[in-house]
């Protein structure tokens, strides 16, 4: 999906008012210096691409974040403020089997959510030069 046509200001507002708090809740009890940010993004569409990937694609050691509140709010924000996003997702996953995942918070998931926090912060500051 090409995130170029999203309403970035509305997504930013959703992040600031809701998603950011849910990410903090998920990370509660974890030191902010515990994980190094290794994932970066260069502009807002790129940031949303990376955010979508880290939020919804299973990775080794972190099978699923999709049942977390921040993930659901991310998905809804993309559906509402990115034209055609939900149709793209429906078509892309039509052949895959629906399955319910157990919510398990692993250290790998915590690291992944820490990366997400960094991506969202970058999304909110699009004019900053890439480090």
């Amino acid at each position: 999906y090409d995130f170029t046509n999203c309403d970035f200001e509305k997504i930013k507002a959703a992040y600031l008012s809701t998603i950011s708090k849910d990410l903090i809740t998920y990370m509660s009890g974890t030191k902010s210096t515990e994980f190094n940010n290794t994932v970066s993004c260069s502009n807002r569409p790129h940031c949303l691409t990376e955010i979508q990937s880290l939020t919804f694609n299973p990775t080794a050691g972190c099978a699923s974040l999709a049942k977390e509140m921040f993930a659901m709010k991310t998905k809804a924000a993309l559906a509402i403020w990115c034209p055609g996003y939900s149709e793209t997702q429906i078509n892309a996953t039509q052949a895959m089997k629906k399955r319910r995942k157990r919510k398990v918070t692993t250290n790998k998931c915590l690291e992944q959510v820490s990366q997400l926090q960094g991506l969202w912060r970058r999304f909110n500051r699009p004019l900053l030069k890439q480090q």
Epitope: E68, S86, T93, R99
Partner: nanobody, 123 residues
Framework: EVQLVESGGGLVQPGGSLRLSCAAS???????????MGWFRQAPGKEREWVSA???????YYADSVKGRFTISADNSKNTAYLQMNSLKPEDTAVYYC??????????????WGQGTLVTVSS
């Protein structure tokens, strides 16, 4: 599998109001459930448009086109979501669908949704 049934659609004059309901069966939502319930609409020949979402913690999102006119709410005890639609305009005419997301991984339908209810705004 969650089944969703919408009701409350109909013909209304511009400036009027309607309240849509969406009853979910096949799943009981408790105070600890994590889910999204939302509404999207589709007018003939037009792309689907998401209008609103409510989350199990009470947070809500609205599309610009309906903000200030539509209000989404949910009653966990009745497994029902509502969309109160005020100051309706002819451009609000569409089939309205209720949808639910329970955070499935690789969700085959992205969201589960109902059959829809037709809202017609015309004088």
């Amino acid at each position: 599998e969650v089944q969703l049934v919408e009701s409350g659609g109909g013909l209304v004059q511009p400036g009027g109001s309607l309240r849509l309901s969406c009853a979910a069966s096949g799943r009981t939502f408790s105070a600890h459930s994590v889910y999204t319930m939302g509404w999207f609409r589709q007018a003939p020949g037009k792309e689907r448009e998401w209008v609103s979402a409510i989350f199990s913690d009470g947070d809500t999102y609205y599309a610009d086109s309906v903000k200030g006119r539509f209000t989404i709410s949910a009653d966990n005890s009745k497994n029902t979501a509502y969309l109160q639609m005020n100051s309706l305009k002819p451009e609000d005419t569409a089939v309205y669908y209720c949808a639910i997301d329970e955070g499935m991984d690789y969700d085959g339908n992205f969201y589960d949704w109902g059959q829809g209810t037709l809202v017609t705004v015309s004088s």
